[in-house]
């Protein structure tokens, strides 16, 4: 998929509450920055089915954020 540009927030809506785990190829977390003041969780779907923003307040998003942070720190 093309690269993100952090000129503005990437997610332009509230985000979906959940995505089927079996459909997830990759999860990316964009932390608040000068360009966007909120955390964004972006899911890349399998089989070239595009991407979705996950509502960062949803249970699934919180689990993903925790998992990624555990992995990174």
């Amino acid at each position: 998929f093309p690269m993100f540009k952090r000129g503005r927030c990437l997610c332009i809506g509230p985000g979906v509450k959940a995505v089927k785990v079996a459909d997830i190829e990759k999860a990316s977390i964009m932390y608040p920055s000068n360009n966007c003041d909120k955390i964004e969780v972006i899911i890349t779907l399998k089989e070239n089915k595009g991407q979705r923003c996950l509502n960062p307040k949803s249970k699934q998003a919180r689990l993903i954020i925790k998992k990624v942070e555990r992995k990174n720190f």
Partner: nanobody
């Protein structure tokens, strides 16, 4: 039941204008980003413009920037695409789409809309030279 119904397509001469409408029902309109996509014969569908539900920000692909304008009338649950200075290469079926998980991707100097879950049936725009 979510419904998106496009209208306003037709045959127009190069340099002319059209205004497409997308009437939405079956969901909380204010929550959903809405985008316009098009598919030309033999080509992939491309996201040409979308509008954010959070702050009304608008995004355009380079191919339509400066010629097309997306706008929203929340009272009428309708999104419009004003298309000016039309070119033969704008000939396509135009779809509107909505999705809570919508996002914009940026590639080669252009914004592309993605992440839509609900789609209309489309309206054909033909631009003759």
């Amino acid at each position: 039941e979510v419904q998106l119904v496009e209208s306003g397509g037709g045959l127009v001469q190069a340099g002319g204008s059209l205004r497409l409408s997308c009437a939405a029902s079956g969901f909380t309109f204010d929550d959903y980003p809405i985008g316009w996509f098009r598919q030309a014969p033999g080509k992939e569908r491309e996201g040409i413009s979308c509008i954010s539900s959070s702050d009304g920000s608008t995004y355009y692909a380079d191919s339509v920037k400066g010629r097309f304008t997306i706008s929203s009338d929340n009272a009428k649950n309708t999104v419009y695409l004003q298309m000016n200075s039309l070119k033969p290469e704008d000939t396509a079926v135009y779809y509107c789409a909505a999705g809570l998980g919508a996002l914009v991707r940026y590639y080669s100097g252009s914004y592309y809309c993605d992440g839509m879950d609900y789609w209309g049936k489309g309206t054909l725009v033909t631009v003759s030279s």
